[in-house]
């Protein structure tokens, strides 16, 4: 039975041009973390694997970058890059867990951290 | 040890479909990305596309105008290469290969010659 | 797409002696967030497919002879052969794989005089 919980950065803004951090936390479980993935509407944009370590699609690379921990940054940000984002836990033996972060690209300076929340 | 072996030769006519398999062994089949890469006679090295078993997601050269298809077994670790409409130029060998982030491609498979003749 | 351009094309070698293979790239491969290069080495011998060499630009693949050897950073990079042997005679290649598509320089054949 699965018992664990993702706990993420939730809805979040951040300004065209700058940077924002993806984060999400696997907890309530004693599974092993075998693999994240992360994506954006159905593109992969990192593999964090335990064995393997980061491979960071070449098509992200001038863009995005690993870290900290099992998180994503991504930077040079444009309006384009506004839009779901999902960190998928492969654990054994769990099996999978998602997380889904929204982020949301502004042109000024108003940008502020919306609030966590938890995905069953 | 890893392995990764290819179906053999095959002999196509222009317009005509072909499909390589790959069949991967001595390793995690899901970790790691499969490449196809392929070399025309005399020729170099050209990336076709690569696909992750891990999550199904795949990267095509454009080049190829759509006409080739990725798709992988995890059951039997099996990785096939399809490629349609064929023409005279796509005759060459094509190679299969492992690939993971930083480590580049380091086994390969031992090749499939594919000669399209009418 | 990044253009990988080899130089020489053709290189003879007497055993026993260094080579050297020239790699530019059209564009920088160094990922700023690891500090590394996405260059790779690999040689074709003949009837053969290719094999790894060197990765990272400079990090020799396991079970390569340690005669080989990976320099450069951002857009120009060496494969250094220390002492040729007969058994390295073949096509060498340079390829990043830093950003799609994943291309490969023209090859560069090292034969024996």
């Known amino acids: 039975m699965m018992t664990g919980t993702i706990e993420t950065t939730g809805n979040i803004s951040a300004e065209k041009g700058g940077s924002i951090i993806l984060q999400c936390h696997l907890s309530s479980t004693t599974a092993q973390v075998t693999q994240v993935n992360w994506e954006q509407q159905d593109q992969l944009l990192a593999i964090c694997n335990a064995d393997l370590g980061w491979h960071i699609s070449p098509s992200f690379k001038d863009r995005v970058a690993p870290g900290p921990g099992l998180g994503l940054t991504l930077q040079s940000l444009t309006v384009n890059d506004t839009g779901e984002y999902f960190c998928i836990y492969h654990t054994y033996p769990d099996g999978t867990y998602t997380g889904r972060i929204f982020l949301e690209v502004l042109e000024s300076s108003v940008a502020e951290h919306g609030a966590r929340f938890q995905i069953p | 040890q890893v392995q990764l072996v290819q179906s053999g030769a095959e002999v196509k006519k222009p317009g005509a479909s072909v499909k390589v398999s790959c069949k991967a062994s001595?390793?995690?089949?899901?970790?790691?990305?499969i490449l196809w890469i392929r070399q025309a006679p005399g020729q170099g090295l050209e990336w076709m596309g690569d696909?992750?078993?891990?999550?199904?997601?795949?990267n095509y050269n454009e080049k190829l105008q759509g006409r080739v298809t990725l798709t992988a077994d995890t059951s039997s670790s099996t990785a096939y290469m399809e490629l349609r409409s064929l023409r005279s130029d796509d005759t060459a060998v094509y190679y299969c290969?492992?690939?993971?982030?930083?480590?580049?491609?380091?086994?390969w498979g031992q090749g499939t010659l594919v000669t399209v003749s009418s | 797409d990044i253009v990988m351009t080899q130089s020489p094309l053709s290189l003879p070698v007497t055993p026993g002696e260094p080579a050297s293979i020239s790699c530019r790239s059209s564009?920088?491969?160094?990922?700023?967030?690891?500090?590394?290069?996405?260059l790779a080495w690999y040689l074709q011998k003949p009837g053969q497919s290719p094999q790894l060499l060197i990765y990272?630009?400079?990090t020799g693949e396991s079970g390569v002879p340690d005669r080989f050897s990976g320099s450069g950073s951002g857009t120009d990079f060496t494969l250094k052969i220390s002492r040729v042997e007969a058994e390295d005679v073949g096509v060498y290649y340079c390829?990043?794989?830093?950003?799609?598509?994943?291309?490969f320089g023209q090859g560069t054949k090292v034969e024996i005089k």
């Open positions: 290969t492992r690939y993971y982030g930083p480590y580049a491609m380091d086994y």
């Open positions: 696909i992750y078993p891990g999550g199904h997601y795949t």
């Open positions: 001595g390793y995690t089949f899901t970790n790691y990305w």
């Open positions: 390829q990043q794989y830093y950003s799609y598509p994943f291309t």
């Open positions: 990272w630009a400079s």
């Open positions: 564009q920088s491969l160094l990922y700023n967030s690891n500090q590394k290069n996405y």
